[in-house]
Structure formats: structure tokens, C-alpha cells
Amino acid sequence: SIPWNLERITPPRYRADEYQPPDGGSLVEVYLLDTSIQSDHREIEGRVMVTDFENVPEEDGTRFHRQASKCDSHGTHLAGVVSGRDAGVAKGASMRSLRVLNCQGKGTVSGTLIGLEFIRKSQLVQPVGPLVVLLPLAGGYSRVLNAACQRLARAGVVLVTAAGNFRDDACLYSPASAPEVITVGATNAQDQPVTLGTLGTNFGRCVDLFAPGEDIIGASSDCSTCFVSQSGTSQAAAHVAGIAAMMLSAEPELTLAELRQRLIHFSAKDVINEAWFPEDQRVLTPNLVAALPPSTHENLYFQ
Amino acid sequence: GAMGQEDEDGDYEELVLALRSEEDGLAEAPEHGTTATFHRCAKDPWRLPGTYVVVLKEETHLSQSERTARRLQAQAARRGYLTKILHVFHGLLPGFLVKMSGDLLELALKLPHVDYIEEDSSVFAQ
């Protein structure tokens, strides 16, 4: 049966026993800045082009054992959530991956900047259709990272990022705090903000909306047919990147402002239990859970 | 995210160093009274001292970025410091990534075209 997260973002009219807008997002290219990925996993084979871009710090610890499946874990799962054949949101979207996170899931602001610059240069060399950039990472507030995101957004690129998993104000993190970026928090099957160990999803006025981010089934790098459940604001951001890809594929001329407005318009309103957030943040945090547009756009979104 | 917000720095640390008018023998000294600022991550364990993104003013051309980077290296060498230019930015932001001692920050902030310098820091999969 359909995984809970795909059901949650699907308009009621389409909730049959399977989620199948088969060509969703086919006009859009989604860039993923993350770990290395297992691009020939059955769930994503032929959908993800691994670019030659790699800018990662060395792994910490003298005895770190680099294991391919662990190195690829985070990125493979997210690629599957965006465009996977069976558990993906935008099954028609093509992706390009850049490696900016090492085998421990760690990267640098500078490496991310160089990755964003690489995307801009690729866009200039070979202009394609709409571009979505997924940044499933977070660091401390960074003026330069936010500035780079702003420049890329002004060049017509849609950037989607994780709000962060620190149970904290997203405005203290980057790229989550960049105003031009679509920042996504995580909710669970009960529409509760996601708790992750002692921490959880970030919140506050720098978050644009929430999306499913707990127990999300997706491609596992453990084997070429494996699936695994992962949780985090990265998974939530991947859902919104997929939804954005489908919206842009249906209406390629949408501006960032229009896309943001549509994402908000079609979101489920006031379903999140706000008691989870600190009292002073409740009024600032958007009570929105991302969803695809309903059947009025049948011809556009569900060809 | 969330358009329409005012700039929010949080606990973000900003060290402002006013530029001296006497410019260390530079031909192309900045206008008197302008300041370049230094930024670093508020979360200490995430800081990566020794690597810095030197961001230049918006209209700076690639050739000027390269020239500024070379100038920094030359001035650092005169003071007995080794530096390494790791990347020159162009296309999104003008500037360069440099590996150098933090002792050189004051010098770097006084270079022509410099808007601000940010110490590199870590980002993490979420």
C-alpha cells in the first residue's frame, strides 16, 4: 500500500491504492548537494546523473573505515524520495548530484559555495528548463552561504533546504535562514513536529512550511533493491523539492514568488500540533504541511 | 526561508575592523572610512579556522579577484606567512577561498574590493 508520506501529500481525489503521477516533474532538473549516491540503485537508475563535482573535507578520526554503502546512504535515500520509481514524489524528474558531504555527512560552507557556483556555471553553459536545488544540509548562520543562495535564486533557480534537526530557531542556521530559499521543517504521520532523539525539527519564522520527515521509506544503499526508513528535515525538504518539480513541470514559467505562494496555498493548514514548539515561536512558525495541488490541475500534474 | 524577514544574525559573531587610512603601500587603497567585516560561526565546534572566504564587492571582475588574491599572498609572504589560494569565485559571488593564518585577517580586510571575510565552517547532513 501507499507509504504514509506519499498519501499525506496526495490530494484525496488521487488516493487510490497507489501513488502514481508517473510523469511528474519531467521538465525539471533537480540538483542534489549531498553525500555520494548509489546512482544505479533500482529505485533511481537512469534518473540521477552523478556530476564530477566533489568538494568534501576528510573524515574525522584516524580509524574511520570508509564503507561505500554508508558513504552513499543519505544522498541515495534523498534521491529516492525526490524521484524514486516506487517511493518517490516526482517520478519523472531527472536529477544531478554533487558531492559536498563526506562519508560522515559532514561538509563545509566553502565546499557548498563552490557547488552552488558549479550549478550556476552549468546553467549558463547549457540552459535547460526550470532548476530546483535541494540542500539537505545545515550549518551555523553564514552570511556568505545565504548571499550565494540569494544570487542563485535571483538567477531563477528554486532552492529548497532542510530547516535543520536542532529543535531550535531555523534563523540561526544556514542556508535555512536565507530568505530566498524555501526552508522545510519535518512532521510525522500524526502531523506532529518530528522529534529526533533529544532534538527535532527546527521551527520559527525562517521556516516556510513543513513536510513529511519521519519514517520515510526510500532507496537504501545497502543493496541495489533495498529500501530503508529515514527521518529528518532533509527528507521533508526532499518532498518539497519533488512537489516543486511537479509544479514547475506543469507551469514552467512560475517565478519563485509564485511557486512559494502555490506551495503555501495548497498546503494543509493548521494541522500541526503547535504545543511542541516553544511558546514564543508558535505564532512565528507556519502551520502548513506541504501537499500537491488537487484535481483541478489534473491535466497539469497527473498526465 | 520565509521571505520578508529582517536580516537575522542570531548569536552570529561579527568583528568589525575599521580600515586605517595608511594602506601598507597599496596602490589601490580603499576609500577612507569604509569598513570590511569579519564573520565566523557562532557555534565554536563548527568553526574551521585557517580557511577563509574573502568576499569582494559585487561588481568586482574575475581579473580583479585574482589580482587581490595575489596581492594578499605577496603581502603575507613579506611578513613571512605562507598562504594558499584554494579557489577563486566568480559566477555567483566575487571573491576567493584562502588557506592562511588568522594573524593575516587584519591585513586581508584592508585589501581593495573586500566586502567581508568569513571563516569557513562545517555543514551537516540533516
Partner: antibody, heavy 115, light 109 residues
């Protein structure tokens, strides 16, 4: 254009081994693995397994597990399928195909097992 | 014994439409969006005609279409032509592998 080119026909004795090659070109090799499928005379298609060109991981069908080994040589963009302890039941045309989606196929390699 | 069940043969006259069924279980056809259909002429390798239930690769005639309901997938060929005479195989993912149907011989009368 995307192409998979296989090695030539083989005749083998029962108990012997055969190694079939498949050279890939015209696409980003690491974006797809290679599947191997065989077809006995007058019969249907049987999936034998898959190998990752990206990291060499394999996924073998239960029926041939223990007798089959798939390998890759990334320097020549070639994938190999070796089948051991051959019997007359292994007489078939062996195909390589691109990925699990099998959207592009090699021309086939006829393997005859006969005493 | 093939994992997926197809009729051994179907036939139709030129210009007619025919449908070939492919029945599996919830562990294969019913559980995945990845049902494919292949056409195979004698002495030739199979050719992909439909992938992911209903998608056509470029270069494949729009006369070929695919669908799925529950555990059964179907291939429909409209406006039959003489060159459509061939064997047709369906395939599906399973949790760890791939399975094919036994094949259907299409005869154009």
C-alpha cells in the same frame, strides 16, 4: 548511441565454465547496472542477476546463485558473466541488458552445452 | 513455471486492437510501479515497448499502451499491423529480483 556488444558464440562440455562479455558504450556507465537474462531454445526469458558498474555489488537470482559470478572491468567498460558447472539445461542465448529497467539489450551470445 | 502469467497466444486482424494480460501477485505486479513489456521477433533480442506500467520509450509507436489494475498489467496494441507479429513478454520487480511472464505469441491474421 547507447550500445551493448557481446562476445561470440561458445560450445562447452558439461561441467565446464563459460565467460560471456558485454561491452557498454554511449551513456554514463555508473548510472545503470547490467542485468543478465537468458533464453533457452523456444522458451521464455529468465533473469539471472545484476551487477553494479558503480561499485561491483551483485544481485543474483536464486536459481543460479553459487554457480554464477558477474564482474566488471571499468577500464574497458566491460561486464562479464561466468557460469560454472554447465549442464545441457544451460544451453541458451545469454543477453546483457542495461539496468533493472532493461531498456537496451546486447545482441545475445549463444552458449551450447553438449557432450 | 513463470512467475507472471500470460496467455500463450493471442491473434487479431490488421487494424484491430488486442490486449495481452500479465497476472502476478501483490509481491510483484501489484506492489511496484515497474512493469515492463518487451517485443521479440525471432532470432532478435527483446525490445522494450512499455516501462513503468504505461510509459513508452521514444521511438515506440503510440499504438502501444500499458496499464495496470491491482495485480494484473495489460498491454494494448491498437491498429494491428503485420510487423506487430512477435512474442511479447512482461516483467516486474519483486522485492529483490526481476520476474518475467512466460510470453505471448501474437499472430496477425
Amino acid at each position: 548511441q547507447v550500445q551493448l556488444v557481446q562476445s561470440g558464440a561458445e560450445v562447452k562440455r558439461p561441467g565446464a565454465s563459460v565467460k560471456v562479455s558485454c561491452k557498454a558504450s554511449g551513456y554514463t556507465l555508473t548510472s545503470y547496472g547490467i542485468s543478465w537474462v537468458r533464453q533457452a531454445p523456444g522458451q521464455g526469458l529468465e533473469w539471472m542477476g545484476w551487477i553494479s558498474v558503480y561499485n561491483g555489488n551483485t544481485n543474483y537470482a536464486q536459481k543460479v546463485q553459487g554457480r554464477v559470478t558477474m564482474t566488471t572491468d571499468t577500464s574497458t567498460s566491460t561486464v562479464y558473466m561466468e557460469l560454472r558447472s554447465l549442464s545441457s539445461d544451460d544451453t541458451a542465448v545469454y543477453y546483457c541488458a542495461r539496468g533493472y529497467g532493461m531498456d537496451v539489450w546486447g545482441q545475445g551470445t549463444t552458449v551450447t552445452v553438449s557432450s | 513455471q513463470s512467475a507472471l502469467t500470460q496467455p500463450a497466444s493471442v491473434s487479431g486482424s490488421p487494424g484491430q486492437s488486442i490486449t495481452i494480460s500479465c497476472t502476478g501477485t501483490s509481491s510483484d505486479v501489484g506492489g511496484y510501479n515497474s512493469v515492463s513489456w518487451y517485443q521479440q521477433h525471432p532470432g532478435k533480442p527483446p525490445k522494450l515497448m512499455i516501462y513503468e506500467v504505461s510509459n513508452r520509450p521514444s521511438g515506440v509507436s503510440i499504438r502501444f499502451s500499458g496499464s495496470k489494475s491491482g495485480n494484473t498489467a495489460s498491454l494494448t496494441i491498437s491498429g494491428l499491423q503485420a510487423e506487430d507479429e512477435a512474442d511479447y513478454f512482461c516483467s516486474s520487480y519483486t522485492s529483490t529480483s526481476m520476474v518475467f511472464g512466460g510470453g505471448t505469441k501474437l499472430t496477425v491474421l
